[in-house]
């Protein structure tokens, strides 16, 4: 069955979000990154559940801490300045979850490293893309 234009748009937005998150993860995991050990000491809140677009609220709430950690890295591996990168992500997240959403994010008890955090949200995006295909 042909995919609707709204579904296609959602898929593209998720792909863009995925691309940005994977770029950050690649930049952090780069073996030349001398700040990695310090970056891994920062803790991020993980969603208790992330299966729907509304759950992106949990990602949005962690974007400011993410930007702070990326500023620490001062890496050229991200293609964009952290502020611009996070701004891009924020715009996409708002478009995907809808700005009128009043969803209250529930967080898991355990916090995560930046690598675990990024892996979680990349997995989320890929899962939704696969569902929409």
């Amino acid at each position: 069955a042909p995919t609707s234009s709204s579904t296609k748009k959602t898929q593209l937005q998720l792909e863009h979000l995925l691309l940005d998150l994977q770029m950050i993860l690649n930049g952090i995991n780069n073996y030349k990154n001398p700040k990695l050990t310090r970056m891994l000491t920062f803790k991020f809140y993980m969603p208790k559940k992330a299966t729907e677009l509304k759950h992106l609220q949990c990602l949005e709430e962690e974007l400011k801490p993410l930007e702070e950690v990326l500023n620490l890295a001062q890496s050229k591996n991200f293609h964009l300045r952290p502020r611009d990168l996070i701004s891009n992500i924020n715009v996409i997240v708002l478009e995907l979850k809808g700005s009128e959403t009043t969803f209250m994010c529930e967080y898991a008890d355990e916090t995560a490293t930046i690598v675990e955090f990024l892996n979680r949200w990349i997995t989320f995006c890929q899962s939704i893309i696969s569902t929409l295909t």
């Epitope: 691309l19 770029m23 890929q126 295909t133």
Partner: nanobody, 118 residues
């Protein structure tokens, strides 16, 4: 380490066409998602076109009906056919390839400049 190399950029008049190529130095598995994004001076990154391992394509509204993405897995090459080019298409175009399973490796090229001007 896999490397991506874009080619085919250049100066073209409005209404003209260009075909960008993205060749890889190593094996990009056919299951990888590949795509093109662009960055114009002073602007954010815009995802232009995507093609999945299964050949499903998706385009930004700004290029729909004008650009066509394709891939030749046997040649480890991806293409972007750009028709009816406009001044606002001027940007550096980057190709990328990403794993759709952990560890989520991402590869992208150095970019090729496309300038649309009369």
């Amino acid at each position: 380490e896999v490397q991506l190399l874009e080619s085919g950029g250049g100066l073209v008049q409005p209404g003209g066409s260009l075909r960008l190529s993205c060749a890889t130095s190593g094996t990009i598995f056919s299951g990888y998602t590949m795509g093109w994004y662009r960055q114009a001076p002073g602007k954010g990154r815009e995802l232009v076109a995507v093609i999945s391992g299964g050949g499903d394509t998706n385009y930004a509204d700004s290029v729909k009906g004008r650009f066509t993405i394709s891939r030749d897995n046997s040649k480890n090459t991806m293409y972007l056919q750009m028709n009816s080019l406009r001044a606002e298409d001027t940007a550096v175009y980057y190709c990328y390839s990403r794993e759709v399973t952990p560890p989520w490796k991402l590869y992208w090229g150095q970019g090729t400049l496309v300038t649309v001007s009369s």
